[in-house]
């Protein structure tokens, strides 16, 4: 993977992909974040590793993406959950799994859900389970808006760069 | 569908969509591939049929999409799986279903997973089942990179143009 | 789109100096529709509420999106379904859930499926269930084409702006 075994700054440099050599007439803000696999009971977004990146003004603050300029963005996220069979001695209770992308804007004093996916899982004996959720859509966003995620079932996340991610790009 | 009942070349022509008649100031590489429904136990991508296409430099080689120019691309894929109930005489074993978009780059000697979705299915008596998986995200890719897919559960794919597809477009 | 509505020479100029503020220099047709939560047993798309919008020529017609200009579009949709446990006295029958984005062009006497997702749900005693479906892809569309959806399981839809939506944007 780009920058594996390199220092963070060298990894960043290694991941700078060649660009078309034209004057930047149209900046194209884009971001792709991955869930930090070293944090098992939380979902921390990272942009400085593997194939994750922040481009043309996107930045990360308090685990949220900051919208660099007003316009329409396509925003997306995926999570994968997994679980083992419950122990015969334990009670099998249903698991509510959910993942949501939220908008926090100075216009509103609360987080507005933009994208929501949900699932009920009923673990059984000898039955490991796996479940994937993906969603994405186009939204009119304002400079300074904060995009964040909320997840129910964090302990069950399969944290890898290809399974748990969050991103956006300007249209 | 455009070109239904036409020879392949006539179908191709029928599918040429009207374009804006301006010099191509901004080429927009894009591709949408569909799983070949005539190949039941493999997943072969096709771009010369139904609503599939390759535009502005994308090409298909060894069942992989070749990235035409360095930059950021949105890459996506979907699969739908289905299965019948297991026979009462047969043992019901869990089915592991997975679909992954992978990157093969001259930088690395292995396939890097970009997008992964997974599911465990437990077929039951008299219970036909259906499951859909979709994922997509933005990636920094380099000219010549190869995008391919790997699927567990290929015999269970519901191969139609609207259920099994793989595509990418430059941002 | 670059230079739409300009004379050829003005269009050329606009493309050589992308920062010139000419009308129609960068139209970006986009639409995001949400399912009307006040209509419980149908799926009516709305663009005049919450975070929904129609931009740069997208329009609605008979619950369909009208394609504003010929070109390649990314088209997407999501639905979330939910259900209660069946009553012990009632028979539990499998539920077929499906969501499809369709193209209608009067070239053909039928709706062409573009995106399809499907699921079989087997409601159990004391087991409420939830299921999400998402899909999206790039298609070559023609000015005036009609994009619509067809859903099996409408009474089970979780109608909220973040769970049930349908959109498209020009690439």
């Amino acid at each position: 993977l780009p920058g594996v075994g390199l220092t963070p700054s060298a990894a960043q440099t290694a991941r700078q992909h060649p660009k078309m050599h034209l004057a930047h007439s149209t900046l194209k803000p884009a971001a792709h974040l991955i869930g930090d696999p070293s944090k098992q009971n939380s979902l921390l977004w990272r942009a400085n590793t593997d194939r994750a990146f922040l481009q043309d003004g996107f930045s990360l603050s308090n685990n949220s993406l900051l919208v660099p300029t007003s316009g329409i963005y396509f925003v997306y996220s995926q999570v994968v959950f997994s679980g083992k069979a419950y122990s015969p001695k334990a009670t099998s209770s249903p698991l509510y799994l959910a993942h949501e992308v939220q908008l926090f804007s100075s216009q509103y004093p609360f987080h507005v859900p933009l994208l929501s996916s949900q699932k009920m899982v009923y673990p059984g004996l000898q039955e490991p389970w796996l479940h994937s959720m993906y969603h994405g859509a186009a939204f009119q966003l304002t400079q300074g808006d904060q995009l964040s995620t909320h997840t129910d079932g964090i302990p069950h996340l399969v944290l890898s760069p290809s399974t748990v991610f969050f991103g956006a790009f300007a249209l | 569908l455009p070109g239904v009942g036409l020879t392949p070349s006539a179908a191709q022509t029928a599918r040429q969509h009207p374009k804006m008649h301006l010099a191509h100031s901004t080429l927009k590489p894009a591709a949408h591939l569909i799983g070949d429904p005539s190949k039941q136990n493999s997943l072969l991508w096709r771009a010369n049929t139904d609503r599939a296409f390759l535009q502005d430099g994308f090409s298909l080689s060894n069942n992989s999409l070749l990235v035409p120019t360095s930059g950021i691309y949105f890459v996506y894929s979907q699969v739908v799986f289905s299965g019948k109930a297991y026979s009462p005489k047969a043992t019901s074993s869990p089915l592991y279903l997975a679909h992954e978009v992978q990157l093969f780059s001259s930088q690395y000697p292995f396939h890097v997973p970009l997008l992964s979705s997974q599911k465990m299915v437990y077929p039951g008596l008299q219970e036909p089942w259906l499951h859909s998986m979709y994922h997509g995200a933005a990636f920094q890719l380099t000219q010549g990179d190869q995008l391919s897919t790997h699927t567990d559960g290929i015999p269970h794919l519901v191969l139609s143009p609207s259920t099994v597809f793989f595509g990418a477009f430059a941002l | 789109l670059p230079g739409v509505g300009l004379t050829p020479s003005a269009a050329q100029t606009a493309r050589q100096h992308p920062k010139m503020h000419l009308a129609h220099s960068t139209l970006k047709p986009a639409a995001h529709l949400i399912g009307d939560p006040s209509k419980q047993n149908s799926l009516l798309w709305r663009a005049n509420t919450d975070r929904a919008f129609l931009q740069d020529g997208f329009s609605l017609s008979n619950n369909s999106l009208l394609v504003p200009t010929s070109g390649i579009y990314f088209v997407y949709s999501q639905v979330v379904f939910s259900g209660k446990a069946y009553s012990p006295k009632a028979t539990s029958s499998p539920l077929y859930l499906a969501h499809e984005v369709q193209l209608f062009s009067s070239q053909y006497p039928f709706h062409v499926p573009l995106l399809s997702s499907q699921k079989m749900v087997y409601p159990g005693l004391q087991e409420p269930w939830l299921h999400s479906m998402y899909h999206g892809a790039a298609f070559q569309l023609t000015q005036g084409d009609q994009l619509s959806t067809h859903t099996d399981g409408i009474p089970h839809l979780v109608l909220s702006p973040s769970t049930v939506f349908f959109g498209a944007f020009a690439l």
Epitope: - | H21 | A47, D56, G57, Q143
Partner: antibody
């Protein structure tokens, strides 16, 4: 330069039919739909419907469905409006129009007057 | 169908005046509104699209604003060639409907 020229207007008896033509030039005919819009004398504008010459896709104002048929001939770069069962209130100037984006009527013909009278 | 109600139906103004025409939609139409200018015996001309964007070649004295149900066309300094009838049109859903028109006459 985009040009649209309508023809076929004139006096029609109530209950009769008309077929209007719209000859297009100055652009690739199959890249854009052709709309028909009408305007009764001293009144406002009313959208009738459109046809896409590329794939013959159509969309009509429900008010005219069943009475209006919009079609095109790619080989002649011409669009047509056929109206049946005409009544006095169909008296109007009929315009064809080519959009930039679908609902923006950017280019117009000069119009052709249809008078429905006995 | 969505109804578009224009006001006033006519107005008299002098060269150099600031003129404002309003259009109200019977339901919210986002920013999907266009404005047209029509002179006697001529076809209409597109002036404004998407509520506030001037079409190619339209002078900067023309501006549009509004979203939802209420829209405005403003001519900041009326010129002799601006005397005409102006129509608003909703582009939100078919059948795309026009307002009844506002005739701008010389005072």
């Amino acid at each position: 330069e985009v040009q649209l020229v309508e023809s076929g207007g004139g006096l029609v008896q109530p209950g009769g039919s008309l077929r209007l033509s719209c000859a297009a030039s100055g652009y690739t005919f199959t890249s854009y739909v052709i709309h028909w819009v009408r305007q009764a004398p001293g009144k406002g504008l009313e959208w009738v419907g459109y046809n896409n010459p590329y794939n013959d896709g159509t969309n009509y104002n429900e008010k005219f469905k069943g009475r209006a048929t919009i079609s095109s001939d790619k080989s002649k770069n011409t669009a047509y409006l056929q109206m049946n069962s005409l009544r006095a209130e169909d008296t109007a100037v009929y315009y064809c129009s080519r959009p930039t984006m679908l609902p923006w009527f950017a280019y117009w013909g000069q119009g052709t007057l249809v008078t429905v009278s006995s | 169908d969505i109804q578009m109600t224009q006001s006033p139906s006519s107005l008299s103004a002098s060269v150099g005046d600031r003129v404002t025409i309003t259009c109200r939609a019977s339901q919210a139409v986002s920013s999907a509104v266009a404005w047209y200018q029509q002179k006697p015996g001529k076809a209409p001309k597109l002036q404004i699209y998407s509520a506030s964007h001037r079409y190619t070649g339209v002078p900067s004295r023309f501006s549009g604003s509004g979203s939802g149900t209420d829209f405005t066309l403003t001519i900041s300094s009326l010129q002799p060639e601006d005397f005409a009838t102006y129509y608003c049109q909703e582009n939100y859903s078919t059948p795309w409907t026009f307002g009844q028109g506002t005739k701008v006459e010389i005072k």
